[in-house]
């Protein structure tokens, strides 16, 4: 059972979003006193796996040689020391892409946007889905989520953004998935390049800039849902 020991750290390499068939390594890092590491997967018999620690005993490796649907899900790890079992780690959500055909991503009215105006990114799937996800490459918070506007399955979801500034510029892809399996995503859409025009080179605007003047660069994370951008698969339900 959980004791007073500090919780371990759990992470995945090369990341927590893995294409079908690719390998992934899950790491659990505890303390030098650890004698054994245990990995639990939600909705699977516990423990899902056990490993002896690697020298110098403060971490263990759990290997997945080829990613499949069976490995997608939510994981926690523990370690055992001479005084008992640790608290559980924070959860790791391992997501598999490639479960469904790729959606199409487009920009309305155009992928060329003037700073201070709006744009809507439209993710469309061939078959009805109920969750759509948008990612911006090389973003501080790369994974951004929206459940489709209605609970019923839809062929598309809209990601409205306003006002647009230079931070919104970049390469986007979207995914679709079914609500019954949050950890299985489609293949990624083809990339969409969003170009924001009218930006100034000077990132420090004068304090008297009016709305008719173009905006300068912005360091605000993109927030299509209006909430704190999420990394991992924590969804923003509308």
């Amino acid at each position: 059972q959980a004791g007073p020991l500090p919780k371990p750290t759990l992470w995945a390499e090369p990341g927590s979003v893995i294409s079908w068939g690719n390998s992934v390594t899950i790491w659990c890092q505890g303390t030098l006193e650890a004698r054994e590491y245990r990995l639990d997967k939600e909705e699977s018999p516990a423990p899902w796996d056990r490993q002896n620690p690697l020298e110098p005993k403060n971490k263990a490796r759990f290997s997945i040689p080829s990613m499949t649907e069976d490995y997608a899900g939510r994981y926690r790890c523990y370690y055992r020391s001479p005084v008992g079992w640790s608290q559980p780690s924070d959860p790791l959500e391992l997501v598999m892409t490639g479960a469904y055909s790729k959606p199409t991503l487009s920009a309305l009215p155009s992928p060329l946007v003037t700073s201070g105006k709006s744009v809507t990114l439209l993710c469309q799937s061939r078959s009805p889905m109920d969750t759509f996800l948008l990612i911006k490459e090389r973003a501080a918070h790369p994974l951004l989520h929206l459940r489709s506007e209605h609970g019923a399955q839809q062929h598309q979801a809209e990601f409205p953004m306003s006002p647009v500034t230079s931070v919104h510029g970049g390469t986007y892809r979207c995914f679709s998935s079914h609500g019954f399996s949050h950890y299985l995503l489609s293949h990624p859409s083809d990339p969409l390049e969003l170009i924001v025009s009218g930006s100034l080179e000077d990132p420090r605007p004068s304090p008297t800039r009016s709305v008719s003047t173009a905006a300068g660069p912005e360091d605000q994370p993109l927030m299509p849902t209006g909430s704190v951008p999420h990394s991992g698969l924590r969804r923003h339900w509308e």
Epitope: K117, S118, E158, P160, P205, G216, P217, E218, Q220, G226
Partner: antibody, heavy 118, light 107 residues
């Protein structure tokens, strides 16, 4: 729970200055753009200014351009509006509001009244 | 600037009535149209964003529709607590602009 609390309003003479503050809590302030919106007594709503999360991009309405300055201190979870060269027509309740990133203002403060009169 | 024309400026209705307010933009604003409710002495509250999406905690009797320049806000069955002034706002292009408001009263 998202909370926005304005302060700093009061009576000021034409040509005078005032600094409004908005204290934010219940959300990660540094992740959101913020607005000031005003409402003259018995009138409609007028958007005043907008500042993005990192202060690097700012917009103003033409009616306040050159007189008002919006700023923020993310370490203090605070938004500010420095109002100079105040005019009688600036008399209004001033609200701070959180930007939702989709063209709307999803949470508003209770407002602070600014009266410009001699 | 984009002008927002809201109508009617006031209306009187009975509890249980279906109430409709319209908002017209001077140019195409796509779906970037929001609706707010304001009660006397209080701050506005967001009800609907992006034309038809209900803000969290807002009762389902409120709805919105439209696109481009013409938009509609509907209360399917008026409740006593809905007595307020309602504003539309375009979020398509800065400066963001509001309609003049519709004051809703109980008959």
């Amino acid at each position: 729970e998202v909370q926005l609390v304005e302060s700093g309003g009061g009576l000021v003479q034409p040509g005078g200055s005032l600094r409004l503050s908005c204290a934010a809590s219940g959300f990660t302030f540094s992740d959101y753009g913020m607005h000031w919106v005003r409402q003259a007594p018995g009138k409609g709503l007028e958007w005043v200014a907008y500042i993005f999360s990192g202060s690097s991009t700012i917009y103003y309405a033409d009616t306040v351009k050159g007189r008002f300055t919006i700023s923020r201190d993310n370490a203090k979870n605070s938004l500010y509006l420095q109002m100079n060269s105040l005019r009688a027509e600036d008399t209004a309740v001033y609200y701070c509001a959180r930007a939702d990133g989709r063209g709307a203002m999803d949470y508003w403060g209770q407002g602070t009244l600014v009266t410009v009169s001699s | 600037d984009i002008q927002m024309t809201q109508s009617p400026s006031s209306l009187s209705a009975s509890v249980g009535d279906r109430v409709t307010i319209t908002c017209r933009a001077s140019q195409d604003i796509s779906k970037f149209l929001n609706w707010y409710q304001q009660k006397p002495g209080k701050a506005p509250k967001l009800l609907i964003y992006y034309t038809s999406r209900l803000h969290s905690g807002v009762p389902s009797r409120f709805s919105g529709s439209g696109s481009g320049t013409d938009f509609t806000f509907t209360i399917s069955s008026l409740q006593p607590e809905d007595i307020a002034t309602y504003f539309c706002q375009q979020g398509n292009t800065l400066p963001w602009t509001f309609g003049g408001g519709t004051k809703l009263e109980i008959k």
